[in-house]
């Protein structure tokens, strides 16, 4: 008799793919635009990225450091009206994109949480959660929670409101902390909270250290659902050299949990390459005219338009990974096993029951390496075959679909491989 199929876990929508943060509407749209009506026109682009949710804003009224002039129920008129927001929500729903609203109160000010009036602000947040849930939003994000006194108890209360409305609603908290103990203490009291942090930002870009960080995190959080990003808001290029962007994209999309990206991560948007642009929110490069300040500063291969036409671009890789992540059982909710592959390398398997399995091998180093995959580290349920088919490489030049002998696997500098192989009883 065939073995019984393993029961599928309950999957919420945020388990099924990536989230895409648009923290600054004006920077995202550029050209002096930057409102909700304009964002509605970009939803097709978000659909093409196959992201599952859009983390938007903050877009509420906030006069810098003034509690009285901060209204979480009012959309800043610069961004549009409540009607514009309702219209955006409806359009997003039609395209199966969920909308998560950032309610970080004092986003224009010094302390995001008005340190002197915590209780008033917390009550305002509570009211806003109920208001916007009724408006139809799919979840909320609050950032800089290290600045919020008694964050754990407030988060638990907000989580109750969010989940009380519907189990299908999500609360994301963001912290600048990279300390595992601080992160765990925030997670402890909040079962379904999705937490973005700077935990991976100091991975030092080495395979061993990254492996150690990832496995420590997964061991410490047990079987709870994680999110993966390098920070609560900033671009990947703030932390990574260009040659590691593809590697990290591959990793973030294939670790067990929800990958969270900021607008521009898919094209390698880099504020440092755009003189005068703010690090935290550079203008999105839709085409070469998106940054007119310095003629010739932007080449086609830095833009969405240019990269869309190039199958070997970072954007094309992002789209392919996002597609795989959202449809393969082993990547959606499969088990994870990291194992040794040699110095400078990080490798792991994702597998679910009798479904196709995936092997990820990442070379963080700047020299080519032979992978010595230590299959002995793996449990019997996750054994390695002699050969696996190459689904994709982060570097051009490999023949995709071809079987590779795992004993003779060689990786180029900064190369990541995603290989697939069938379940064998």
């Amino acid at each position: 008799r065939a073995p019984r199929c393993r029961e599928l876990p309950a999957q919420k929508w945020w388990h099924t793919g990536a989230l895409y943060r648009i923290g600054d509407l004006q920077a995202f749209q550029g050209h002096g635009a930057g409102n909700l009506a304009g964002l509605k026109g970009r939803l097709d682009y978000l659909s093409s990225l196959k992201v599952k949710g859009l983390v938007l804003g903050p877009i509420h009224k906030n006069q810098k450091d003034d509690v009285a002039q901060t209204d979480l129920l009012q959309i800043d008129p610069n961004f549009g009206s409540k009607e514009d927001f309702d219209s955006l929500l409806q359009s997003a729903k039609k395209k199966s994109i969920r909308v998560i609203l950032d309610l970080t109160p004092n986003y224009r000010g010094e302390n995001s949480w008005f340190s002197t009036q915590v209780d008033t602000v917390a009550t305002k947040v509570k009211d806003a959660l109920e208001f916007w849930l009724q408006a139809g939003v799919d979840g909320f994000q609050v950032r800089d929670i290290e600045n919020l006194k008694d964050a754990s108890s407030f988060l638990a209360e907000w989580q109750n409101i969010t989940k009380g409305f519907s189990e299908d609603r999500l609360l994301i908290a963001g912290t600048n902390s990279s300390d595992l103990q601080q992160i765990l203490s925030l997670l402890e009291s909040n079962k379904d909270l999705l937490l973005t942090s700077s935990y991976l930002s100091d991975s030092g870009s080495t395979g061993e250290h990254t492996k150690s960080l990832v496995t420590q995190y997964l061991n410490a959080t047990g079987n709870r659902w994680c999110s993966w990003s390098l920070s609560q808001a900033r671009l990947l290029t703030s932390f990574l050299p260009a040659q590691l962007l593809r590697l990290y994209q591959l990793m973030l999309f294939t670790l067990p949990g929800t990958p969270v990206f900021s607008y521009g991560d898919e094209i390698g948007l880099d504020a440092a390459a755009l003189p005068g642009q703010p690090m935290e929110a550079p203008v999105m490069l839709w085409d070469e005219s998106s940054f007119p300040d310095i003629p010739g500063a932007v080449s086609a291969n830095m833009t969405v338009k240019g990269q869309s036409e190039d199958p070997g671009s970072l954007l094309s890789l992002f789209r392919r990974l996002s597609d795989q992540r959202s449809k393969e059982r082993s990547l959606l909710h499969g088990d994870f096993h990291a194992f040794s592959a040699g110095p400078g390398l990080f490798s792991y398997i994702r597998h679910w029951d009798q479904n196709e399995r995936f092997l990820v091998v990442l070379n963080f180093g700047d020299v080519g390496l032979s992978a010595g995959l230590q299959a002995s580290d793996l449990p019997a349920s996750a054994s390695l075959p002699a050969k696996a088919d190459l689904l994709l490489s982060t570097q051009p030049g490999r023949e995709e679909g071809s079987p590779l002998e795992l004993e003779r696997l060689k990786l180029e500098p900064h190369e990541g491989l995603l290989l697939r192989f069938p379940y064998a009883a």
């Epitope: 129920l73 509570k126 009211d127 959660l129 109920e130 208001f131």
Partner: nanobody, 125 residues
Framework: QVHLVESGGGLVQAGGSLRLSCAAS????????MGWFRQAPGKEREFVGT????????YYTDSVKGRFTISRDNAKNTVYLEMNSLKPEDTAVYFC??????????????????WGQGTQVTVSS
């Protein structure tokens, strides 16, 4: 069961002011979001504004923003609607409503479970 009774309506000149009250009995309303709506002759019932259970947060429809203010006194089980700079287009029957499921009411009347009978406000030009 919550019983809501509005009062304070009447005839007023354009530019004038009125203060409507909504007194609740039967249950304390301190955990309910409260809303004000209005209905002009031959028109649909229209959202005016809402206030959270603690009174910390309010939300108004654009046409009354800056002119109308909602407040509440939970000790008196009463909600108020202060209306200034009234215009002829504000003429309508004004209703208050209670949302027993949410601390913060919303703009859609379907979310409110208890309604008053209404009080007539007429603004002459």
């Amino acid at each position: 069961q919550v019983h809501l009774v509005e009062s304070g309506g009447g005839l007023v000149q354009a530019g004038g002011s009125l203060r409507l009250s909504c007194a609740a009995s039967g249950r304390t309303i301190s955990t309910y979001g409260m809303g004000w709506f209005r209905q002009a002759p031959g028109k649909e019932r229209e959202f005016v504004g809402t206030i959270s259970c603690s009174g910390t947060s309010t939300y108004y429809t654009d046409s009354v923003k800056g002119r109308f203010t909602i407040s509440r006194d939970n000790a008196k089980n009463t909600v108020y609607l202060e209306m200034n700079s009234l215009k002829p287009e504000d003429t309508a029957v004004y209703f208050c409503a209670a949302d027993t499921r949410h601390c913060m009411g919303y703009t859609k009347h379907g979310g409110y479970d208890y309604w008053g009978q209404g009080t007539q406000v007429t603004v002459s030009s």
